[in-house]
């Protein structure tokens, strides 16, 4: 019968969702509740991940697949498989050891996560600043000054700023 008596490993007949039960002659047994085996031929079932505290369940555990977690509102996932939840900040901020802090002048963050990044230096590409940067948005680079000769463009040059790339806060 199906539990092969040949030289092949009898455990190979055990489907996902079961384990090869060493307690009873390598017969396939269903995984207990709150455990799973995602592939056939397993000798044990893995304990289901529990999404507790700041984690919440995105996908329930089944006999063949682990639970999947995400983070409660105000937090976001970090790491493979959402192994950690990190506090959200507002746009224009970054998370430090002391909590959420505004981006320093000359940097921005347009997401609720991650770090503040420097504004783009338009001049490195031979371009000029079309829209000034803020804590929440990067600068927008426009045509190079050479492209702005009379009649060459209808783009109005930006008003002079107190410092390059800076928008009054």
């Amino acid at each position: 019968f199906e539990r092969t008596r040949s030289l092949q490993d009898p455990c190979s007949n055990c489907p996902a969702g079961t384990f090869c039960d060493n307690n009873r002659n390598q017969i396939c047994s269903p995984c207990p509740p709150n455990s799973f085996s995602s592939a056939g031929g397993q000798r044990t079932c893995d304990i289901c991940r529990q999404c507790k505290g700041v984690f919440r369940t995105r996908k329930e555990c089944s006999s063949t697949s682990n639970a999947e977690c995400d983070c409660t509102p105000g937090f976001h996932c970090l790491g493979a498989g959402c192994s950690m939840c990190e506090q959200d900040c507002k746009q224009g901020q970054e998370l430090t050891k002391k909590g959420c802090k505004d981006c320093c002048f000359g940097t921005f963050n347009d997401q609720k996560r991650g770090i503040c990044r420097p504004w783009t230096n338009c001049s490195l590409d031979g371009k000029s600043v079309l829209v000034n940067g803020t804590k929440e948005r990067d600068v927008v680079c426009g045509p190079s000054p050479a492209d702005l000769s009379p009649g060459a463009s209808s783009v109005t040059p930006p008003a002079p700023a107190r410092e390059p790339g800076h928008s009054p806060q």
């Epitope: 007949n13 055990c14 489907p15 969702g17 009873r24 017969i27 269903p30 207990p32």
Partner: antibody, heavy 123, light 108 residues
């Protein structure tokens, strides 16, 4: 709680195929093995075989050449087919939830049974 | 396959008496995988004892199971009128699962 209900023809002609279905209600068919057992009139219980929700099967060697089991998880049902029947296959046929472990690896026997359906093989 | 042999085939007793039913396996069976079932006429079997000695949900304390290896026992300490029935032992330690031929407990 989980309940099982067998259904199928009560009369089958010799040499034909007996077909029965077991419907699982009050719970999911998933994550368990499911067994068929039969009992000829006035006799004891005989295990026919079992099927897992993935379709993996184990059959009693005494019947293996004639038995086919299948499962339909979308309908919460599993089925038995027994080919080339003779009068010796006349019996009450039961479906049951096969043994399983709880979270602490305590093993439970066949704890849920259908009420049984009588199948007579006669021309 | 593992052959399960029950004795006696029939047990004639009066209500209030103690019933001792025996089940012997042709080879050693882990006690975790030995069950006892009760069957009344026209009804499906009902799980009484699993793991050789653990009562299933709703089973009265007068039913008890014991044993290990090849020899197992079901004891009914004081027979009640509703206990007169056929009792089967069953192993699911090794495929194919097998039942004993049954012991009928009848009123004397």
């Amino acid at each position: 709680q989980v309940q099982l209900q067998e259904s199928g023809p009560g009369l089958v002609k010799p040499s034909e195929t007996l077909s029965l279905t077991c419907t699982v209600s009050g719970g999911s068919i998933s994550s368990y093995y499911w067994s068929w057992i039969r009992q000829p009139p006035g006799k004891g219980l005989e295990w026919i075989g079992r099927i897992y929700t993935s379709g993996s099967t184990n059959y009693n060697p005494s019947l293996k050449s004639r038995v086919t089991m299948s499962v339909d998880t979308s309908k919460n049902q599993f089925s038995l087919k027994l080919s080339s029947v003779t009068a010796a296959d006349t019996a009450v046929y039961y479906c049951a939830r096969d043994g399983w472990y709880d979270e602490d690896y305590n093993y439970y026997g066949m704890d849920v049974w259908g009420q049984g359906t009588t199948v007579t093989v006669s021309s | 396959e593992i052959v399960m042999t029950q004795s006696p085939a029939t047990l004639s007793l009066s209500p209030g008496e103690r019933a001792t039913l025996s089940c012997r396996a042709s080879q050693s069976v882990s006690s975790n995988y030995l069950s006892w079932y009760q069957q009344k006429p026209g009804q499906a079997p009902r799980l009484l004892i699993y793991g050789a000695s653990t009562r299933a949900t709703g089973i009265p304390a007068r039913f008890s199971g014991s044993g290990s290896g090849t020899d197992f026992t079901l004891t009914i300490s004081s027979l009640q009128p509703e206990d007169f029935a056929v009792y089967y032992c069953q192993q699911d330690y090794d495929l194919p699962w097998t039942f004993g031929q049954g012991t009928k407990v009848e009123i004397k």
